[in-house]
Interface confidence: low
Amino acid sequence: GELETSDVVTVVLGQDAKLPCFYRGDSGEQVGQVAWARVDAGEGAQELALLHSKYGLHVSPAYEGRVEQPPPPRNPLDGSVLLRNAVQADEGEYECRVSTFPAGSFQARLRLRVLVPPLPSLNPGPALEEGQGLTLAASCTAEGSPAPSVTWDTEVKGTTSSRSFKHSRSAAVTSEFHLVPSRSMNGQPLTCVVSHPGLLQDQRITHILHVSFLAEASVRGLEDQNLWHIGREGAMLKCLSEGQPPPSYNWTRLDGPLPSGVRVDGDTLGFPPLTTEHSGIYVCHVSNEFSSRDSQVTVDVLDPQEDSGKQVDLVSAS
């Protein structure tokens, strides 16, 4: 006859491991007992349990309550046992020794592999600001046995670097994601993906990117200077920028206070019917928690009568 077992038995931490050992004998052969022992290299054999055809199962004190026979129905030639609630320390070599009648003794070894699924953690890097250059966006760490794989899933352009720390029975892997912060990254997901044979599916932790920026400010409304003449109604200046966080706007006049009747409405400066007192240098100040920008324009309110008078002078001069 011969023994049937597995070279490797793989189990996830906390699950029950079935250690197989089946004697496939000739007709009329019987199994008297099956002895299980742990036989790691460099250490003496440590008895787990003894299955006796007459006396049943005997578990050694070190494994009391942790070794059982598989549930019935049982084949008298089956010497398999269950190791309950596998822990990392259970990983190693095991041997089953089968005593048969009349064929004698047989033995076989297997390796128990205990997978320790990782519990990943994601740590965001420092606050991201446009113009920083290559910056740490996030790091992701996962420890397990065997070493987990840590990758990144994102539409964002960036570079990754990984390092691994080996412990006695596990390994910790840390991956860092670096990027050049840009405004287009705002709201983009950066997902750490951890793969491991002890996981039914990849574990994913998502971090939403926030990049502070403030665009250059500019002022619209002065495209046609001829529209800025005495008496014109509805004249306005609009300050344009964009930023994250969204910026606030403030209007001032460089050469004095804002004239009476001029109203500030956020990014817009609205004028009453224009007079020459509205001529001056106006400054739009845009700011958010990241930065501030200024844009200034010169308003020159034209007097149509002055212009026509000049034209008359020119005509008379000719």
Partner: antibody, heavy 122, light 107 residues
């Protein structure tokens, strides 16, 4: 997968109007500036207009300023180009394109739609 | 507006050849230059950004170099699928402008 699909092209008479649409999918539309680029038959590429991510005003090529209006509806993931007072020289394939809006290397166009043909002829 | 001038306007080459296309800007544009490939009836495809950075998914036989006003696109070993028109584009200032294109044809 990033996808841009233009629609709305066709034959229109000089002086007429047309509205092009560009449906975006596969990325966060509101985070990216968008451009329209056109290509006259047998000719090279010409940038038409750009719209930012929401704060700053749009930009236009001098050749279309005052006639074309770019807009976007972030809730519908759609970019538009309203074309008025069309001329024969506006005849072209119009592409919408996503801009890689990154200060580290400016505004190039990393994804393009398949294009829609606009023909202006009497 | 910044003018972009490509040369040559067309070239004939064989599979396996090394092909070089140049692009000159009318004023300095630092590295704000992109290269695109366009096949007949298709949309342009970004090959190179920031003058020398290879866009994800583009074969490594494509490379870009240059800064300031003079730029080069090189195809180290021309493949059958590389026969197309290539455009450079500056995005240093608005409006962004394209070169007139270089058509790479089979010899």
């Amino acid at each position: 997968e990033v996808q841009l699909v233009e629609s709305g092209g066709g034959l229109v008479q000089p002086g007429g109007s047309l509205r092009l649409s560009c449906a975006a999918s596969g990325y966060i539309f509101s985070n990216y500036a968008m451009s329209w680029v056109r290509q006259a038959p047998g000719k090279g590429l010409e940038w038409v207009s750009r719209i930012s991510t929401g704060f700053a005003g749009p930009d236009y090529a001098d050749s279309v300023k005052g006639r074309f209006t770019i807009s976007r509806d972030n809730s519908k993931n759609t970019l538009y180009l309203q074309m008025n007072s069309l001329r024969a020289e506006d005849t072209a394939v119009y592409y919408c394109a996503r801009q890689t809006e990154d200060r580290s290397y400016g505004y190039d166009l990393d994804y393009w739609g398949q294009g829609t043909l606009v023909t202006v002829s009497s | 507006d910044i003018q972009m001038t490509q040369s040559p306007s067309s070239l004939s080459a064989s599979v396996g050849d090394r092909v070089t296309i140049t692009c000159r800007a009318s004023q300095g544009i630092s590295s704000y230059l992109a290269w695109y490939q366009q096949k007949p009836g298709k949309a342009p495809k970004l090959l190179i950004y920031a003058a020398s950075s290879l866009q994800s998914g583009v074969p490594s036989r494509f490379s870009g170099s240059g800064s300031g006003t003079d730029f080069t696109l090189t195809i180290s070993s021309l493949q059958p699928e590389d026969f197309a028109t290539y455009y450079c584009q500056q995005h240093y200032t608005t409006p962004p402008t394209f070169g007139q294109g270089t058509k790479v044809e089979i010899k």
